[in-house]
């Protein structure tokens, strides 16, 4: 039994780090493998993560962690029974993938304006809470070419756009994702999408 692709890990900078790797053949990850992780810190203890299958030869492990600080560094040991398959380390603050925003809502009752709001996925005491920026993706269910991205570079988790920038009488979907420049994070996963029917009054044309 060998590791084909070494574990790579990302942290949500809150309570979970996710490590993925591939074995050289079909593996029952949860029964055959264990990922041990330990904070490099005085009097820390080793903790065990039981991996799950992620495709035939792929494994994924969700490492439970305390709140992350930039100094944190973990040793990682991948074991198959008594055999050490791989040894590495992981610094969560250098491999951050934010949590996806939630509760995306489209408010259509504001006069000819669409107000999109969503929730910041972090509690106020988390460092990332005040450092997230967002990308909002809006697309038409009818027209694949009608696909747009709005970058939200301010802290407020909301976006206002004129309803008239979209076609009237058509159903649209929106989703949002987040990233944090301060830690040079990757983008989060997209939030679940939300759907609405876009309709607005065409301005009265005088001849």
């Amino acid at each position: 039994m060998k590791v084909l692709q070494e574990p790579t890990c990302v942290s949500d900078y809150m309570s979970i780090s996710t490590c993925e790797w591939k074995m050289n053949g079909p593996t029952n990850c949860s029964t055959e493998l264990r990922l041990l992780y330990q904070l490099v810190f005085l009097l820390s203890e080793a903790h065990t993560c039981i991996p799950e299958n992620n495709g035939g030869a792929g494994c994924v492990c969700h490492l439970l962690m305390d709140d992350v600080v930039s100094a944190d560094n973990y040793t990682l040991d991948l074991w198959a029974g008594q055999q050490l398959l791989w040894k590495g380390s992981f610094k969560p603050s250098e491999h951050v993938k934010p949590r996806a925003p939630g509760n995306l809502t489209v408010h259509t009752n504001v006069s000819d304006t669409l107000l999109l709001t969503w929730s910041n996925p972090y509690p106020p005491d988390n460092y990332l809470y005040n450092h997230l920026t967002y990308a909002v993706n809006i697309w038409s269910e009818n027209d694949p070419a009608d696909f747009r991205i709005y970058n939200v570079t301010y802290l407020e988790p909301s976006l206002r756009i004129a309803a008239s920038t979209l076609k009237s009488g058509i159903s649209y979907r929106a989703r949002v994702r987040a990233w944090a420049q301060c830690y040079n994070t990757t983008w989060s996963e997209w939030s679940p999408s939300t759907k609405w029917h876009n309709s607005y009054r065409e301005p009265f044309e005088q001849h």
Partner: antibody, heavy 125, light 112 residues
């Protein structure tokens, strides 16, 4: 009441051995790291050794490394310090102390918040 | 190894007056914001040491609020706002950031 009680001290000749014990009560012993500190007559405090809650990680002062062994039996809520090749300079009062909560991912530190009454070790010929 | 240097080594104080003890570490004991691994202990004559302050500024349970700790990185201070007769003894700072733990030399507080 959280309590630590040391025992095992006494008079020993240079080169001899002693085993100190520290019985813990009133807290979940296995969840906490434990530490030994000593104090030579008329001197200040000197850290000797520490062990994590699961016993998997141990640390020693250079002055005792290779001679002293720290261990614990969590089923008996007891900490030990095996002292071999004793020297005159090991003469001191030995205290055990409750250290950080080490079962969490990042150990949570509250200081050495509980100390035993101390046990006296005298090394002399 | 980290060296912990305390000053003064002797501190005569009049009851009711404030007192201050300094402790300097040879390297930073700051792990992350709010986590300075420095403690203060008091050892009264014939007794075991007792914890006063941990993590630089957190008062241990049951410690009177006249005791306070401050500082970050390498410089730390223990202050007693109004010294009482029962406060006499030896005060030690200690770093618990890395092995080996190291105590300061101790400061003897006595009543004038």
């Amino acid at each position: 009441e959280v309590q630590l009680v040391e025992s095992g001290g006494g008079l020993e000749q240079p080169g001899g051995s002693l085993r100190l014990s520290c019985a813990g009560s009133g807290f979940t012993f296995r969840d906490f790291a434990m530490t030994w500190v000593r104090q030579a007559p008329g001197k200040g405090l000197e850290w000797v050794s520490s062990v994590s809650g699961d016993g998997g990680n141990t640390y020693y002062a250079d002055s005792v490394k290779g001679r002293f062994t720290i261990s614990r039996d969590n089923s008996k809520n007891t900490l030990y310090l095996q002292m071999n090749s004793l020297r005159a300079e090991d003469t001191a009062v030995y205290y055990c102390a409750k250290d950080r909560l080490s079962k969490t991912i990042r150990p949570r530190y509250y200081g050495l918040d509980v100390w035993g009454q101390g046990t006296t070790v005298t090394v002399s010929s | 190894d980290i060296v912990m240097t305390q000053s003064p080594l002797s501190l005569p104080v009049t009851p009711g007056e404030p007192a201050s003890i300094s402790c300097r570490s040879s390297q930073s004991v700051l792990y992350s914001i709010g986590y300075n691994y420095v403690d203060w202990y008091l050892q009264k004559s014939g007794q075991s040491p007792q914890l006063l302050i941990y993590l630089g500024n957190k008062r241990a349970s049951g410690v009177p609020d006249r005791f306070s700790g401050s500082g970050s990185g390498t410089d730390f201070t223990l202050k007693i706002s109004r010294v009482e007769a029962e406060d006499v003894g030896f005060y030690y700072c200690m770093q618990a950031y890395q092995s080996p733990y190291v105590f300061g030399q101790g400061t003897k507080l006595e009543i004038k």
